[in-house]
């Protein structure tokens, strides 16, 4: 199930998704003056099995005399079959890469891609927030947002993060550097069944970064 909206914006914060759930789609967009190659894929798709996930398809841009006017698309499930698999791993990736089962890493850059990457997230996707330079974090809880299915509709949880200027006094003393635990998110929700696959980010990842990666169109 695709998430309808983009993750929430927090003032003076930026977010990233450190990994993408299987089913995530990334539009193959090119920068101005370039277009997708004629036989090229419209999107990349995170696919895999329990032990290994990777991006199907490869985005390729070529020089264009005329502007690329193709619309951004959200492919339908039936369009997703019989696509060529291409490993999008850099040959020089260090071996200590963090990886999550059922998730793909950020695809490496491709030549002349658009500045913004347009992702189509699926339910269970998590993004991580961090205050930008010059601001510090005041936490009430996890600095993350998860796309959840509630009452048949998708929504992003609200990250429990406030970013304040360096000189401003802390509203939450002692809560400047908490360990964001993925469990027990404070959420004011009416009790109903929430269908989501909340994945737990590896402790090392969660501890080192209260961060994020991309949203459907996040730059």
């Amino acid at each position: 199930e695709l998430c309808d909206d983009d993750p929430p914006e927090i003032p003076h914060a930026t977010f990233k998704a450190m990994a993408y759930k299987e089913g995530t789609m990334l539009n193959c967009e090119c920068k101005r003056g370039f277009r997708r190659i004629k036989s090229g894929s419209l999107y990349m798709l995170c696919t895999g099995n329990s032990s290994h996930s990777s991006w199907d398809n490869q985005c390729q841009c070529t020089s264009s005399a005329t502007r690329n006017t193709t619309k951004q698309v959200t492919p339908q499930p039936e369009e997703q079959k019989e696509r060529k698999t291409t490993e999008m791993q850099s040959p020089m990736q260090p071996v200590d890469q963090a990886s999550l089962p059922g998730h793909c890493r950020e695809p490496p850059p491709w030549e002349n891609e658009a500045t913004e990457r347009i992702y189509h997230f699926v339910v269970g996707q998590m993004v991580y927030y961090q205050c930008v330079q010059g601001y510090r974090a005041l936490h009430r809880g996890p600095a993350e947002s998860v796309c959840k299915m509630t009452h048949g509709k998708t929504r992003w949880t609200q990250p429990q993060l406030i970013c304040t200027g360096e000189m401003e006094t802390s509203q939450f003393p002692g809560e400047e550097k908490p360990q964001a635990s993925p469990e027990g998110r404070p959420e004011s929700e009416t009790s109903c069944l929430v269908t989501t696959t909340d994945f737990q980010i590896q402790t090392e990842m969660a501890a080192t970064m209260e961060t994020s990666i991309f949203t459907t169109e996040y730059q």
């Epitope: 993750p7 914006e9 930026t14 977010f15 990233k16 450190m18 920068k31 850099s90 020089m92 990736q93 260090p94 200590d96 890469q97 963090a98 890493r105 950020e106 695809p107 490496p108 850059p109 491709w110 030549e111 002349n112 891609e113 658009a114 500045t115 913004e116 990457r117 961090q130 205050c131 930008v132 330079q133 080192t208 970064m209 961060t211 994020s212 990666i213 991309f214 949203t215 996040y218 730059q219």
Partner: nanobody, 130 residues
């Protein structure tokens, strides 16, 4: 696939200077943080410096602050690292790397970690003799 190619490494005396360059032909600079890691023999790879390709903001590891200067030429698709007052401790293989920016084109230094880069160069060796 797009590649990062480093150059400029070599042997230099302590106190001397070197200028490393990373060529990233075809990279859309304003979507990435681009910069440098280094790995000395028997040690972990560590972040040295990066520049935000969108807004030009920079980061330096404490160990190189005031001695190293990172700059980019978006038209030429290159990122340079000017290394001054080199010390024997600076000797290492220097790797160019890129990482996607976060939302709103922002980037934070805690993301500049070895496991999380999107693409790596093959490295260039810097030797500093005392």
């Amino acid at each position: 696939q797009l590649q990062l190619v480093e150059s400029g490494g070599g042997l230099v005396q302590a106190g001397g200077s070197l200028r490393l360059s990373c060529a990233a032909s075809g990279l859309t600079f304003d979507g990435y943080a681009i910069g440098w890691f280094r790995q000395a023999s028997g040690k972990e790879r560590e972040g040295v410096s990066y520049i935000n390709g969108r807004d030009g903001s920079t980061f330096y590891a404490d160990s190189v602050k005031g001695r190293f200067i990172i700059s980019s030429d978006n038209a030429k698709n290159t990122v340079d690292l000017q290394m001054n007052s080199l010390k024997p401790d600076d000797a290492a293989v220097y790797y160019c790397a890129v990482d996607r920016l976060g939302s709103r084109g922002a980037y934070v230094s805690t993301w500049w970690r070895s496991p999380d880069m999107d693409l790596w160069g093959k490295g260039t060796l810097v030797t500093v003799s005392s």
